[in-house]
C-alpha cells in the first residue's frame, strides 16, 4: 500500500477504509440508514463527491490524483443517529523524494514513452516503478520496459497500448532501503498526449494551369475520422532568397484529402510538405518529407 492512512473519528467508528488500487472508499454498513454521503477534499480545498445510493456502504472515486494528499469524509444518518468520519490520506515519505517532471507521449500510433526525473531529495538507492490503470476496466498495467539512468528507472516504454482507454491513471511508486519515498500520480488523456505521424502517400500532379496535392491521413492511436484532422501545407519555391515567406495553407480533413492550387507552366522548382493535427487540439505532427515538382529552368 502506497501511503499511511490516519483516521479521525468519534467513539463509535464507521471504520472507513480506502483502497488506492480500486479508488474505493468503504465503511461499515449501518442498520436503517436514511442518508449517506462520501467526498474528498484536496489540498486546494476542492471537493469531489461521487454519486451514492442510500443503501451503499462504499463509493468509488473515478478521476482523482492523490499525491498532494487528500482527506476523505463519510457522513451517514440512520433512523437513530448520525455518524461522521474523516480519513486522512497523506503522501507519506520524505518531501521531495517523489518522481518529478513526469510526462508521457504516444507516437507511431501504437507506442508510448513516459519519462520522469529522480526527486531532488531521493537517496542514491531509490528505485521507481510505473503502474497505469485505465478508466474503464480498472486494469493495471505494469511497465514492461524501463529506461534507466545509472540503474534508476527514469522512464518507461510501452509497445502494447491495448489496455489503455481515453483517460488513464499513472502512478509512479518509489522504494528505498534508507527512507520512505513519496509517490507521484497523474491523469492523462490519450488525445492530449498523442504525437501524430506526418501524413503519408503525399503526391503532386500538375497540368498546364494547376497542381493537385493528395495525401492520406496518418494512422493514429486514437480512433479519429477524417473531419477530426487539420492539415497544413508548406508550398515552397526552391532557390528563393533567405527570409522569403513560405506559403502555409490550412486545409480541413476530408474523405479525400486534396489541395488544388493554380500554378501555370513553365513552373519553377517547388517543394511541398504537409503536417497533421487533431482539429480540437492542434498539436502538430512533424512535417512529411518534401516532395519536389516543377523544373530548375521554370
Amino acid at each position: 500500500e502506497k501511503s499511511d492512512l490516519r483516521t479521525v473519528a468519534p467513539a463509535s467508528s464507521l471504520n472507513v477504509r480506502f483502497d488506492s488500487r480500486t479508488m474505493n472508499l468503504s465503511w461499515d454498513c449501518q442498520e436503517n440508514t436514511t442518508f449517506s454521503k462520501c467526498f474528498l477534499t484536496d489540498k486546494k480545498n476542492r471537493v469531489v463527491e461521487p454519486r451514492l445510493s442510500n443503501n451503499e456502504c462504499s463509493c468509488t472515486f473515478r478521476e482523482i490524483c492523490l499525491h498532494e494528499g487528500v482527506t476523505f469524509e463519510v457522513h451517514v444518518n440512520t433512523s437513530q443517529r448520525g455518524f461522521q468520519q474523516k480519513l486522512l490520506y497523506p503522501n507519506s515519505g520524505r518531501e521531495g523524494t517523489a518522481a518529478q517532471n513526469f510526462s508521457c507521449f504516444i507516437y507511431n500510433a501504437d507506442l508510448m514513452n513516459c519519462t520522469w526525473a529522480r526527486g531532488p531529495t531521493a537517496p542514491r538507492d531509490v528505485q521507481y516503478f510505473l503502474y497505469i490503470r485505465n478508466s474503464k476496466r480498472r486494469r493495471e498495467i505494469r511497465c514492461p520496459y524501463y529506461i534507466q539512468d545509472s540503474g534508476t528507472h527514469v522512464g518507461c516504454h510501452l509497445d502494447n497500448l491495448s489496455g489503455l482507454t481515453s483517460r488513464n491513471y499513472f502512478l509512479v511508486n518509489g522504494t528505498s532501503r534508507e527512507i520512505g519515498i513519496q509517490f507521484f500520480d497523474s491523469l492523462l488523456d490519450t488525445k492530449k498526449i498523442e504525437r501524430f505521424n506526418p501524413p503519408s502517400n503525399v503526391t503532386v500532379r500538375c497540368n498546364t494551369t494547376h497542381c493537385l496535392v493528395r495525401w492520406k491521413q496518418p494512422r493514429t492511436y486514437q480512433k479519429l475520422s477524417y473531419l477530426d484532422f487539420q492539415y497544413q501545407l508548406d508550398v515552397h519555391r526552391k532557390n528563393t532568397q533567405p527570409g522569403t515567406e513560405n506559403l502555409l495553407i490550412n486545409v480541413s480533413g476530408d474523405l479525400e484529402n486534396r489541395y488544388n492550387f493554380p500554378s501555370s507552366e513553365p513552373r519553377a522548382k517547388h517543394s511541398v510538405k504537409i503536417r497533421a493535427a487533431d482539429v480540437r487540439i492542434l498539436n502538430w505532427s512533424s512535417w512529411s518529407e518534401a516532395i519536389e515538382f516543377g523544373s530548375d529552368d521554370g
Partner: antibody, heavy 120, light 111 residues
Amino acid sequence: QVQLVQSGAEVKKPGASVKVSCKISGHSLSELSIHWVRQTPTKGFEWMGGFDPEENEIVYAQRFQGRVTMTEDTSIDTAYLTLSSLRSDDTAVYYCSIAGSIPGWAFDYWGKGTMVTVSS
Amino acid sequence: QAVLTQPSSVSGAPGQRVTISCTGSGSNIGAPYDVSWYQQLPGTAPKLLIYHNNKRPSGVPDRFSASKSGTSASLAITGLQADDEADYYCQSYDSQLISAAFGGGTKVTVL
C-alpha cells in the same frame, strides 16, 4: 466523390420486417463509419445506430435494441439496416450516413433516404 | 421529445442576421461533446453545415457560423438569402443515452 445510394421505398404490414440497403461508391466501406438515422414528422430525427470505431463494433440506440440489426458487406461496399416487429410509428424516412467525426459524430454524407410505410 | 431544444421557427428579411439556439444538458453539449448543425431543404436529405462546434465543411459559405458555450450552442446566418429558407437541426452525442442526439429543428423563413 462519395455517394450513398439507398434502396427504394417499402410498404410493410405491422409485425413484418424491412431491410434497407445503402451502397457506397467512391470510397471503400471498410474505411468508413456508417450510421442509420430515421426521420418522422412527429419525432424528428432519431439516431438508430452505427459503427463506432472506438468500440470497434456496431452500436445501437437503446430504444431500438432487439429490433434492429445493422450489417455490412464490405466486398460490395453495401450496408444494411433490418428493422423487425414493425409498428405504425416506424413509418419514417430512413437515412444512411457517414460519421466524419469521433466522438460526437458529425454526419457528413447522407443517402437520399428510403421511405418505409407501415400500414395494415 | 427531442433531447436538444431548438425554437420551432425564426424569420428575417433578406440581408438580415438570424440566430438559432440549441439547448442541451450536462450529458451532451455540456459533457462536453461537439455540436454539429444541418440544413434540410424540403424533400431532401440533411446537409452538414457545421461540425466541431464552429467548423464549416468545404463549400459551406462563411455566412454560416456557430458557437458553443456551456450546455448551449447557436447557429448564426448573416446576409440572409431566399435559398436559406429551410429546416435547421443541431446534433450532439449524449453519454446518458449512449446515442447521437438531435434537436427538434427550426424552420427559417425569409420574409
